[in-house]
């Protein structure tokens, strides 16, 4: 479980979401698909809403392999939808801090 | 011209009130969250407040929380700040900043301030 | 809240002196910090972001190094427009923090 007040800003947010989402990379709002890029995005919802795991997972640009159903194709995303590639943030020790809060 | 430009500032009583304002230009205000930063005199920065882009979500530092209130109106590109209760010991020029920078896909990916206001003087004393 | 120190407060330096400011933080901030200049009665003014970019129009004579904790401001050539007070800034999470300045006076 998480605290409900949990929030993640700045620079540790980049650095979070890196590390959740690996070499799938990530967008900083859901694609459209789900939810509107301009109504909704990251920031806001971790920023200044309150932040899980499972949310942050939600941004990471494809599934996760152990989380797709083998039944459906993953979803084919436009190649110019914005990603973040990994290792352009990341750095180890902030992303520590920072799960580790997020799971209390 | 981008720019911003603050007003509101003045000598007011410990317990009074004021209400700056931050008139931007230059850039499309609606896009960016925008803070309060202030300095006391012969004193350092300190973080006073921030607002996202499309407003409703703030944050405060935890000396101004439940007195000062951040608001903005993207529809006049302006930036507010309610101060009540105040004290002494906010006393200072108070600056508005333009924070949360964006990639070339309009991604949110930096948080440093690039653009601020000249500031105004904020005086509480009796 | 994380903590941001500067040394030293004071530095008396002469033009073509290059200069060192050091920033530490309390806890590690990756990369994300600021160095701004501010001048008496002047907003202060974005010198270098991400610890080591330099902000479109600075001149090439400032530059920023460091990651984690541990951060530095390099001026290489001092000039007479540099003298004014230097301020680092973590935004890796809220509340935003800045050092206590760094005053660059003429020896």
């Known amino acids: 479980a998480y605290r409900p007040s949990e929030t993640l800003c700045g620079g540790e947010l980049v650095d979070t979401l890196q590390f959740v989402c690996g070499d799938r990379g990530f967008y900083f709002s859901r694609p459209a698909s789900r939810v509107s890029r301009r109504s909704r995005g990251i920031v806001e919802e971790c920023c200044f809403r309150s932040c899980d795991l499972a949310l942050l997972e939600t941004y990471c640009a494809t599934p996760a392999k152990s989380e797709r159903d083998v039944s459906t194709p993953p979803t084919v995303l436009p190649d110019n939808f914005p990603r973040y590639p990994v290792g352009k943030f990341f750095q180890y020790d902030t992303w520590k801090q920072s799960t580790q809060r997020l799971r209390r | 011209e981008v720019q911003l430009l603050e007003s509101g500032g003045g000598l007011v009583q410990p317990g009074g009130s004021l209400r700056l304002s931050c008139a931007a230009s230059?850039?499309?205000?609606?896009?960016?969250?925008m803070s309060w930063v202030r300095q006391a005199p012969g004193k350092g920065l300190e973080w006073v407040s921030s607002i996202y882009s499309s407003g409703g979500w703030t944050k405060y530092t935890d000396s101004v929380k439940g007195r000062f209130t951040i608001s903005r109106d993207n529809s006049k590109n302006t930036l507010y700040l309610q101060m009540n209760s105040l004290r002494a010991e906010d006393t200072a020029v108070y600056y508005c900043?333009?924070?949360?920078?964006?990639?070339?896909?309009?991604?949110?990916?930096?948080?440093?301030?690039?653009?601020w206001g000249r500031g105004t003087l904020v005086t509480v004393s009796s | 809240d994380i903590q941001m120190t500067q040394s030293p407060s004071t530095l008396s330096a002469s033009v073509g002196d290059r200069v060192t400011i050091t920033c530490r933080a309390s806890?590690?901030?990756?990369?994300?910090l600021a160095w701004y200049q501010q001048k008496p009665g002047k907003a202060p003014k974005l010198l270098i972001y991400?610890?080591?970019s330099l902000e479109s129009g600075v001149p090439s004579r400032f530059s920023g190094s460091g990651s984690g904790t541990e951060f530095t401001l390099t001026i290489s050539s001092l000039q007479p427009d540099d003298f004014a007070t230097y301020y680092c800034?973590?935004?890796?999470?809220?509340?935003?923090?800045f050092g206590q300045g760094t005053k660059v006076e003429i020896k």
């Open positions: 806890q590690s901030i990756s990369s994300w």
């Open positions: 230059g850039f499309t205000f609606s896009e960016y969250e």
């Open positions: 900043a333009k924070g949360v920078h964006y990639d070339s896909s309009g991604l949110p990916i930096d948080w440093y301030f690039d653009l």
């Open positions: 800034q973590q935004y890796n999470s809220y509340p935003w923090t």
């Open positions: 991400k610890a080591s």
